[in-house]
């Protein structure tokens, strides 16, 4: 039969950051190839990564169609050299992925501090809004566009001369904080979705940016 000596995929795993979404699986193929199908709960399966020898498949284009839907992918195993028109009616071995809801499960990418500006004893810190591959009306949406007020940023800031950290939070991409006049401060931000109750509710911290370097601007008033 057309599927003898093929091994079903296993360890199907979703890897997703800011909606860029890859399905990975095992094993590395020996004399077999894979085709991936993905579907929402409608059961209308769409094939991707046809007869690939890779053990990953980029499914971003499918999941960004509706990031609030729940998706399932399945990986079919075929003998190497398989041609679809061979006429075998036997269903090849396949394995299902875990269910995946992008809006709830995509990891938050490491944010970046775009700029900071000091005016007297106030500093305005701006977080760069990351672009995603999610579209609306043929326009790519930013992370803020997609998550709206579900997404907050936490700012950690401290005097360059000490280690005691303070925090501030915003549900926009800007912070306005009070600082001591004449002191240099360092900043790091973290993206957070407070409504999530899982390990992926927070991003990693941004790179640290400190006053007195080119990213910021200081105006004493």
């Amino acid at each position: 039969s057309g599927t003898t000596n093929t091994v079903a995929a296993y360890n199907l795993t979703w890897k997703s950051t800011n909606f860029k979404t890859i399905l990975e699986w095992e094993p590395k193929p020996i004399n077999q190839v894979y085709t991936v199908q993905i579907s929402t709960k409608s059961g209308d399966w769409k094939s991707k990564c046809f007869y690939t020898a890779d053990t990953e498949c980029d499914l971003t284009d499918e999941i960004v169609k509706d990031v609030k839907q729940t998706y399932l992918a399945r990986v079919f195993s075929y003998p190497a050299g398989h041609v679809e028109s061979t006429g075998s009616t036997e269903e090849p071995p396949y394995e299902n992925s875990p269910e995946f809801t992008p809006y709830l499960e995509t990891n938050l990418g490491q944010p970046t501090i775009q700029s900071f500006e000091q005016v007297g004893t106030k500093v305005n810190v701006t977080v760069q809004d990351e672009w995603t591959l999610v579209r609306r009306n043929d326009t790519f949406l930013s992370l803020r566009d997609v998550f709206g007020k579900d997404l907050i940023y936490t700012l950690y800031y401290w005097k360059s001369s000490s280690s005691g950290k303070k925090t501030a939070k915003t549900n926009t991409n800007e912070f306005l904080i009070d600082v001591d006049k004449g002191e240099n401060y360092c900043f790091s931000v973290q993206a957070v979705i407070p409504s999530r109750r899982t390990a992926n509710r927070k991003s990693t911290d941004s790179p640290v940016e400190c006053m007195g370097h080119e990213k910021g601007e200081s105006r004493e008033i």
Partner: antibody, heavy 118, light 107 residues
């Protein structure tokens, strides 16, 4: 709240036809595969047929292939089962169920009784 | 076709006791593809467990599913009066088939 309401059951003679309907509400109908499951009096559950959200993919248990046709009208939020060439062994309560991916059955109607007898 | 065999056919227990229901498949079923249902007389079935171990929405945590390959188990940690019913397993790895059911009755 998800609600599924079957109708169209009744008494029919062997060889006859019947069309079951299932009116769905409380969810986006086209986003889900749907299924029919039956239960003969005093017996266990038997899957009959499933259909994808678009209606493009249909599946049947061997015993009803060629006799039963599953379909859906997403504009009316309604699932159908056209049953032809009915046999005595088709006598059962027929349940409509919401069926994510066509795999498991997460919401059920209360069922409609089909009796095939002369 | 994968055949599912449930045992025991009938389980006689008292409220507060632990119930262990077995479902055995004629060939290996990926654990992603097994579900459990509860059915009371005159009512439609209700989904309890899918994916062998994931509880459906609104199902109390006294219900748990486990197993892989050909052997699966539904456990009710402490039977409540409303838990006395018939329980069915169902696989969806190859077509859809149900087990014959286990009746949990009051002792």
């Amino acid at each position: 709240e998800v609600q599924l309401l079957e109708s169209g059951g009744g008494l029919v003679q062997p060889g006859g036809s019947l069309r079951l309907s299932c009116a769905a509400s409380g969810f986006t109908f086209s986003n889900y595969a749907m299924s029919w499951v039956r239960q003969a009096p005093g017996k266990g559950l038997e899957w009959v047929s499933s259909i994808s959200g678009s209606g493009d993919y249909t599946y049947y248990t061997d015993s009803v292939k060629g006799r039963f046709t599953i379909s859906r009208d997403n504009s009316k939020n309604t699932l159908y089962l056209q049953m032809n060439s009915l046999r005595a062994e088709d006598t059962a309560v027929y349940y409509c169920a919401r069926s994510p991916w066509g795999y498991y059955l997460d919401s059920w109607g209360q069922g409609t009784l089909v009796t095939v007898s002369s | 076709e994968i055949v599912l065999t449930q045992s025991p056919g009938t389980l006689s227990l008292s409220p507060g006791e632990r119930a262990t229901l077995s479902c055995r498949a004629s060939q290996s079923v990926s654990s992603s593809y097994l579900a459990w249902y509860q059915q009371k007389p005159g009512q439609a079935p209700r989904l309890l467990i899918y994916g062998a171990s994931s509880r459906a929405t609104g199902i109390p945590d006294r219900f748990s599913g486990s197993g892989s390959g050909t052997d699966f188990t539904l456990t009710i940690s402490r039977l409540e009066p409303e838990d006395f019913a018939v329980y069915y397993c169902q696989q969806y790895g190859s077509s859809l088939t149900f087990g014959g059911g286990t009746k949990v009755e009051i002792k």
